[in-house]
Interface confidence: low
């Protein structure tokens, strides 16, 4: 009987198994009983990343600067263009179709992980002994000042948003 399934990198058409086109090439014509599958390379602005029987190559992604995007890796006939975001911006979604500004960590929170082109800033609450008094996309929680090392005493306790206030020791007569 004519085959109902074909080997890897083949496809079934007109009761025959034809070779798929390799990545970077599109299908021009199916094989016949005495000709092989005919494939053609994708043009410079196109790609196909799998063994395929596509009659059209896919357009490379456009990294639109108006959306804050720039090219991280230029596409080839076998790979799509990879976009990333301009400095200070990160991808809005996994497909990185547009960019948004990195978020800042509010006072009382510090930067746990600085944002990249593809991920936003990760903030963490400042634990006891640390504070952040600024809204920043770069600043980590800073430790409270150690009054003792300055031969001073704590005059005002620190919070997650403020440093301790040090002052001179009361000298008892």
């Amino acid at each position: 009987e004519p085959p109902t399934a074909c080997r890897e990198k083949q496809y079934l058409i007109n009761s025959q198994c034809c070779s798929l086109c390799q990545p970077g090439q599109k299908l021009v014509s199916d094989c016949t009983e005495f000709t092989e599958t005919e494939c053609l390379p994708c043009s410079e602005s196109e790609f196909l990343d799998t063994w395929n029987r596509e009659t059209r190559c896919h357009q490379h992604k456009y990294c639109d600067p108006n959306l804050g995007l720039r090219v991280q890796q230029k596409g080839t006939s076998e790979t799509d263009t990879i976009c990333t975001c301009e400095e200070g911006l990160h991808c809005m979604s996994e497909s990185c179709e547009s960019c948004v500004p990195h978020r800042s960590c509010l006072p009382g929170f510090g930067v746990k992980q600085i944002a990249t082109g593809v991920s936003d800033t990760i903030c963490e609450p400042c634990p006891v002994g640390f504070f952040s008094n600024v809204s920043s996309a770069f600043e980590k929680c800073r430790p409270w000042t150690s009054c003792e090392t300055k031969d001073l005493v704590v005059q005002q306790a620190g919070t997650n948003k403020t440093d301790v206030v040090c002052g001179p020791q009361d000298r008892q007569r």
Epitope: Q16, S19, S29, D30, T32, E33, F34, T35, E36, E38
Partner: antibody
């Protein structure tokens, strides 16, 4: 269903040109199939003459090459064979075929 | 040219019995992609050839499953598991891997 039908004169004089046409129905000639001419002298075996594709690309049997011309007319969905300088040995049933489907054949006799 | 040699040239068979036809090519019919373009045709008396098998072992649509093809490289076989009266005719192998395409001389199957 694909059907092929040969047509042309049944009698050709020696040294003249044999001309045959194959009309294809039930299938567009402009798809990726190669359209063949095959002949069979009376009481003998089959001989491949050549093929043509819809875009005019072709391949001919070297034993006949300098006498064979094939052409294709996509508007009429047909293809043709011309064999020049014929002699008695060219007397045969001529088939047009896509290999999976064949015409019924037409007998061409070369005789004065 | 690739020479296709069939044997036997004549094959008398009893109805209901199996039959086997061999076809040998003068060079390998496997192409660089691993495909082997070897066809088998049946020509009943007074009719056009009809394709039975393509690419060595693939039965063409409508062909009874008593017909099977096998082989590789240069050695190919057509088998009929149980011969029926309608199987009488001449069987041809045809290679379409190399140009020019070439047929075997034909094997005449007849009923004993």
């Amino acid at each position: 269903q694909v059907q092929l039908q040969e047509s042309g004169p049944g009698l050709v004089k020696p040294s003249d040109t044999l001309s045959l046409t194959c009309a294809v129905s039930g299938y567009s000639i402009t798809t990726n199939y190669y359209w063949n001419w095959i002949r069979q002298p009376p009481g003998k075996g089959l001989e491949w003459i050549g093929y043509i594709n819809y875009d005019g690309s072709n391949n001919y049997n070297p034993s006949l090459k300098n006498r064979v011309t094939m052409s294709v007319d996509t508007s009429k969905n047909q293809f043709s064979l011309k064999l020049s300088s014929v002699t008695a040995v060219d007397t045969a049933v001529y088939y047009c075929a896509r290999l999976d489907y064949w015409g019924q054949g037409t007998l061409v006799t070369v005789s004065s | 040219d690739v020479v296709m040699t069939q044997s036997p040239l004549s094959l008398p068979v009893t109805l209901g019995q199996p039959a086997s036809i061999s076809c040998r090519s003068s060079q390998s019919l496997e192409n660089s992609n691993g495909n082997t373009f070897l066809n088998w045709f049946q020509q009943r008396p007074g009719q056009s050839p009809r394709r039975l098998i393509y690419k060595v072992s693939n039965r063409f649509s409508g062909v009874p499953d008593r017909f099977s093809g096998s082989g590789s490289g240069t050695d190919f076989t057509l088998k009929i598991s149980r011969v029926e009266a309608e199987d009488v005719g001449v069987y041809y192998c045809l290679q379409v891997t190399h140009v020019p395409f070439t047929f075997g001389q034909g094997t005449k199957l007849e009923i004993k």
